[in-house]
C-alpha cells in the first residue's frame, strides 16, 4: 500500500518551488501534457552552454513525512540528447542529481540551507535511459523516463527534495513522493493494523476480530516488510467464539442464526439445533431444551434434548412358592436416550390387611434398581401376603424432570405355605425294567396333600431330555420302562392347595439285572 505525500500530477495551481541561483537559464515552471492528455505542472531547465561548475537548483516545498522512515520518490522526466544540440558545449550533461534535506518545520529560505551537498543529503545521480533526439529533416523522438529513488532513513518531521542540474536540457514532468505501508489485513480471523515499517521487517501483533478468541499457542503476529508487503508466514490466529462461525473468507465471525448453534470456539460452522431444542436468539452457543426435555450433566452441549421414558409395559409375573419372576416390555417411549434402566418399588400387605413398604427380608436379583435387562427375580416372599410391585423406567434425565415418575404396577398374592420336601423314599420292589417306590406322607401346613410329582433320570444321563416326570395321587409310584441293571436318581415333591413343595433329596435306586431274580421287595 502506498501513501502519497506529494503528487505534482494532482496539483492544479502553480507549484512555486524555490530555485537557486536567481539567474537566466534557471529551472522554469511550465505547463505540460501527460500520457493521459491531462495538463500538468512541470519544471524545465535547458542551460547547455552554462559555465563549468555552475549548478541550477530546484527545491520542493516542505513535505511532512507522516511517520514514514523511508520515502520513495518517483520521477518522470524527459532529457534531450546532447548530440542533438548543435550549440551544446562540452559541459552538456545527460544526468542530474537528487538530494533531500530534513527539518522539523518549514524553515528553509531562498538562501538556506546552503545549496550544497552537506547539509543536503545526496540520494542519487540520475541518468536518462531514454533521450529525446532530433536528426535533420526528421521528427524529434523520445520517451519519458521513470525512476524511483529511496530516501531515508528519515527522523525529522519533514523534508525537502532538491534537484541539481549541471548542464542538462531536461524537464521534470512529475514527482510522486510516497511511503509504503502494510495495509490493514485480516487473516485467520486476526486483524493486523495498518503499519508503517520502521525497519527492514517489523513484527506486528494481531488482535482477534470481534467475536473471535485467541487460538492456543503464541499470540498471533505477522511481519511488515519495508516494501509494504506482509511477510508470508503461517498465522496461529484466532477462532470464532461459541455461537459464532467464520465468514467472508475467514475475516469475520458471524453470529449463528436463530435455530442454529455452535457450542465450542474454533473451526466449524453453526449447526441446526439438535432434536427437541431451539435457539430464539442469534449467537447461540447452546440450544435450549423444549419444555419437558433435558440434557444430562454428562451430555455434550450439542447433544439432542431428551425426556424421561414412559412406563414399562406388560409386566408378567410368575410366582413359584416364595420366589417371583417379573418380566416386562421396554417402554414405548425411550425419551431419545440409550441409557435406559429399570427400578422397582415394593409394598406388602399382610393377611390382616395392614400394608407397608417391603421389608429387608426380600432379595432382588440382579437388584431392585439400575436394572438394564427387563426382568427381576424376587425371593423371600412370605406366604399368604399380597405384594404390589411398581416397575419404573429411568434414563439419564429422569432426575431432572419434575412430577411423578410413570410406572407399571403388578399385584402378586403368595399362596399359603406349600408342603415340605419328601425325603424318605424307599424302593418296595424292583425288576429289570421297573421300580416301585413309596414314601411317607409329608405334613402339609395348609391343607391335605393333593398329589405328588416324581422326577427321575438314569444316573449319568443328566440332560433335560433324559429327565422324566410322573404324577401320582398316592404316596407311592411305579416307574416302568427302565433299563436293565441301571442306576436311577429319584426325587419327589408334594402339592397342596398352596402349590408344590420343594423336591426332596435325590434317592439312588437300581433295576435288576435279569428276570430270574423275580420281583424283589426292597425295604428302606
Amino acid at each position: 500500500l502506498e501513501e502519497t505525500l506529494l503528487n505534482t500530477k494532482l496539483e492544479t495551481a502553480d507549484l512555486k518551488w524555490v530555485t537557486f541561483p536567481q539567474v537566466d537559464g534557471q529551472w522554469e515552471e511550465l505547463s505540460g501534457l501527460d500520457e493521459e492528455q491531462h495538463s500538468v505542472r512541470t519544471y524545465e531547465v535547458c542551460d547547455v552552454q552554462r559555465a563549468p561548475g555552475q549548478a541550477h537548483w530546484l527545491r520542493t516545498g516542505w513535505v511532512p513525512r507522516r511517520g514514514a522512515v523511508h520515502v520513495y520518490a518517483t520521477l518522470r522526466f524527459t532529457m534531450l540528447e546532447c548530440l542533438s544540440l548543435p550549440r551544446a558545449g562540452r559541459s552538456c550533461k545527460e544526468t542530474f542529481t537528487v538530494f533531500y534535506y530534513e527539518s522539523d518545520a518549514d524553515t528553509a529560505t531562498a538562501l538556506t540551507p546552503a545549496w550544497m551537498e552537506n547539509p543536503y543529503i545526496k540520494v542519487d545521480t540520475v541518468a536518462a535511459e531514454h533521450l529525446t533526439r532530433k536528426r535533420p529533416g526528421a521528427e524529434a523522438t523520445g520517451k519519458v523516463n521513470v525512476k524511483t529513488l529511496r530516501l531515508g532513513p528519515l527522523s525529522k518531521a519533514g523534508f525537502y527534495l532538491a534537484f541539481q542540474d549541471q548542464g542538462a536540457c531536461m524537464a521534470l514532468l512529475s514527482l510522486h513522493l510516497f511511503y509504503k505501508k502494510c495495509a490493514q489485513l485480516t487473516v485467520n480471523l486476526t486483524r493486523f493494523p495498518e503499519t508503517v515499517p520502521r525497519e527492514l521487517v517489523v513484527p506486528v501483533a494481531g488482535s482477534c476480530v470481534v467475536d473471535a478468541v485467541p487460538a492456543p499457542g503464541p499470540s498471533p503476529s505477522l511481519y511488515c516488510r519495508e516494501d509494504g508487503q506482509w511477510a508470508e508466514q503461517p498465522v496461529t490466529g484466532c477462532s470464532c467464539a461459541p455461537g459464532f462461525e467464520a465468514a467472508e473468507g475467514n475475516t469475520k465471525c458471524r453470529a449463528c442464526a436463530q435455530g442454529t448453534f455452535k457450542p465450542l470456539s474454533g473451526e466449524g460452522s453453526c449447526q441446526p439445533c439438535p432434536a427437541n431444542s431451539h435457539s430464539n436468539t442469534i449467537g447461540s452457543a447452546v440450544c435450549q431444551c423444549r419444555v419437558g426435555y433435558f440434557r444430562a450433566r454428562t451430555d455434550p452441549r450439542g447433544a439432542p434434548c431428551t425426556t424421561p421414558p414412559s412406563a414399562p409395559r406388560s409386566v408378567v409375573s410368575r410366582l413359584n412358592g416364595s420366589s417371583l419372576h417379573l418380566e416386562w416390555s421396554a417402554p414405548l417411549e425411550s425419551g431419545g436416550r440409550e441409557d435406559l434402566t429399570y427400578a422397582l418399588r415394593c409394598r406388602e400387605c399382610r393377611p390382616g390387611g395392614s400394608c407397608a413398604p417391603c421389608g429387608g427380608d426380600l432379595t432382588f436379583d440382579p437388584g431392585p434398581r439400575d436394572l438394564v435387562e427387563p426382568w427381576v427375580v424376587v425371593r423371600g416372599l412370605r406366604p399368604d401376603f399380597t405384594y404390589t410391585f411398581e416397575v419404573t423406567a429411568l434414563n439419564g434425565v429422569s432426575s431432572l424432570a419434575t412430577g411423578p415418575v410413570p410406572f407399571e404396577p403388578v399385584n402378586v398374592t403368595t399362596d399359603r405355605e406349600v408342603p415340605p420336601a419328601v425325603s424318605d423314599i424307599r424302593v418296595t420292589r424292583s425288576s429289570p425294567s421297573s421300580l416301585s417306590l413309596a414314601w411317607a406322607v409329608p405334613r402339609a401346613p395348609s391343607g391335605a396333600v393333593l398329589d405328588y410329582e416324581v422326577k427321575y433320570h438314569e444316573k449319568g444321563a443328566e440332560g433335560p431330555s433324559s429327565v422324566r416326570f410322573l404324577k401320582t395321587s398316592e404316596n407311592r409310584a411305579e416307574l416302568r420302562g427302565l433299563k436293565r441293571g441301571a442306576s436311577y436318581l429319584v426325587q419327589v415333591r408334594a402339592r397342596s392347595e398352596a402349590g408344590y413343595g420343594p423336591f426332596g433329596q435325590e434317592h439312588h435306586s437300581q433295576t435288576q439285572l435279569d428276570e430270574s431274580e423275580g420281583w424283589r421287595e426292597q425295604l428302606a
Epitope: L30, S31, L80, R87, A140
Partner: antibody, heavy 126, light 107 residues
Framework: QVQLVQSGAEVKKPGSSVKVSCKAS????????ISWVRQAPGQGLEWMGQ????????DYAQKFQGRVTITADESTSTAYMELSSLRSEDTAVYYC???????????????????WGQGTLVTVSS | DIQMTQSPSSLSASVGDRVTITCRAS??????LNWYQQKPGKAPKLLIY???ILQSGVPSRFSGSGSGTDFTLTISSLQPEDFAVYYC?????????FGQGTKVEIK
C-alpha cells in the same frame, strides 16, 4: 503570458528577399517549436516551416523548400523567417506562432500553436 | 505532403444551431490534428488539439472527435461570436498542413 512581437510591414520588389523577425518575451524559448504560417489576402492559412531553437535545424513545407530559411537566436529569444526570390503571389500576412508545450513537456507531438504574433504584412510589388 | 480536405467550404447557420465541420486527411495521421478559429483581421486562435482536447479557456460547446483520416469539429449551440473561419491542421509528420478552411456565416 508569453508575447510574440513581429517586425513591421515590408514592401519588396519581385526577386528580392524579406526577413521577418519574431521576438518572444518571458521565459523559455529554446525548447518550444516556432512555426511560420502565411495567409494571402482572402485565402486560407499556409504552413511554411518550423524550428525548435535548441536543435538549430528547421523543417520546411515542400512548397517552400530552397526558398525559405528559418533561424533562431537563443540569446535574444528571436526567430527569423527569410523568404527569397519573392513573387507577387508571396504577398501575404506572415505569422509566427509558438507551440503550446515544449519539446520536453509533452508526451505527444501535437505542435498545437497557442501563441501567435500580430502578423507582418509583406507586399511584393514592382 | 499530407493533404487536408475540409467540408463544407462555407455554411450558413443560425444562433443556437448545431454545426459540424469535417476534415479528411490523405493518409493516416492518428490523432495529430488541431482546430483553429480565425476572425477577420486577427491571428488564428487554437480551439482543440490532439483531435479532441479542448484548449484552456475555450467554451465547452466546441468539441472534436476522430482518428486516422476522418475528423469532426462540432459546435453544439452556435453563438454570435462563433461566426468565423475554422481551419484543421495536421501535425503528423515534419511538414504540417492546413485545410482550406470553412466559413461559418449568419443565415
Amino acid at each position: 503570458q508569453v508575447q510574440l512581437v513581429q517586425s513591421g510591414a515590408e514592401v519588396k520588389k519581385p526577386g528580392s528577399s524579406v526577413k521577418v523577425s519574431c521576438k518572444a518575451s518571458g521565459g523559455t524559448f529554446s525548447t518550444y517549436a516556432i512555426s511560420w504560417v502565411r495567409q494571402a489576402p482572402g485565402q486560407g492559412l499556409e504552413w511554411m516551416g518550423q524550428i525548435i531553437p535548441i536543435f538549430g535545424d528547421a523543417d520546411y513545407a515542400q512548397k517552400f523548400q530552397g526558398r525559405v530559411t528559418i533561424t533562431a537566436d537563443e540569446s535574444t529569444s528571436t526567430a527569423y523567417m527569410e523568404l527569397s526570390s519573392l513573387r507577387s503571389e508571396d504577398t501575404a500576412v506572415y505569422y509566427c506562432a509558438r507551440s503550446s508545450y515544449t519539446i520536453l513537456t509533452t508526451y505527444y507531438n501535437y505542435n498545437a500553436m497557442d501563441n501567435w504574433g500580430q502578423g507582418t504584412l509583406v507586399t511584393v510589388s514592382s | 505532403d499530407i493533404q487536408m480536405t475540409q467540408s463544407p467550404s462555407s455554411l450558413s447557420a443560425s444562433v443556437g444551431d448545431r454545426v459540424t465541420i469535417t476534415c479528411r486527411a490523405s493518409q493516416n495521421i492518428n490523432n495529430f490534428l488541431n482546430w483553429y478559429q480565425q476572425k477577420p483581421g486577427k491571428a488564428p486562435k487554437l480551439l482543440i488539439y490532439g483531435s479532441s482536447i479542448l484548449q484552456s479557456g475555450v467554451p465547452s460547446r466546441f468539441s472534436g472527435s476522430g482518428s486516422g483520416t476522418d475528423f469532426t469539429l462540432t459546435i453544439s449551440s452556435l453563438q454570435p461570436e462563433d461566426f468565423a473561419v475554422y481551419y484543421c491542421h495536421q501535425v503528423s509528420d515534419t511538414s504540417d498542413t492546413f485545410g482550406q478552411g470553412t466559413k461559418v456565416e449568419i443565415k
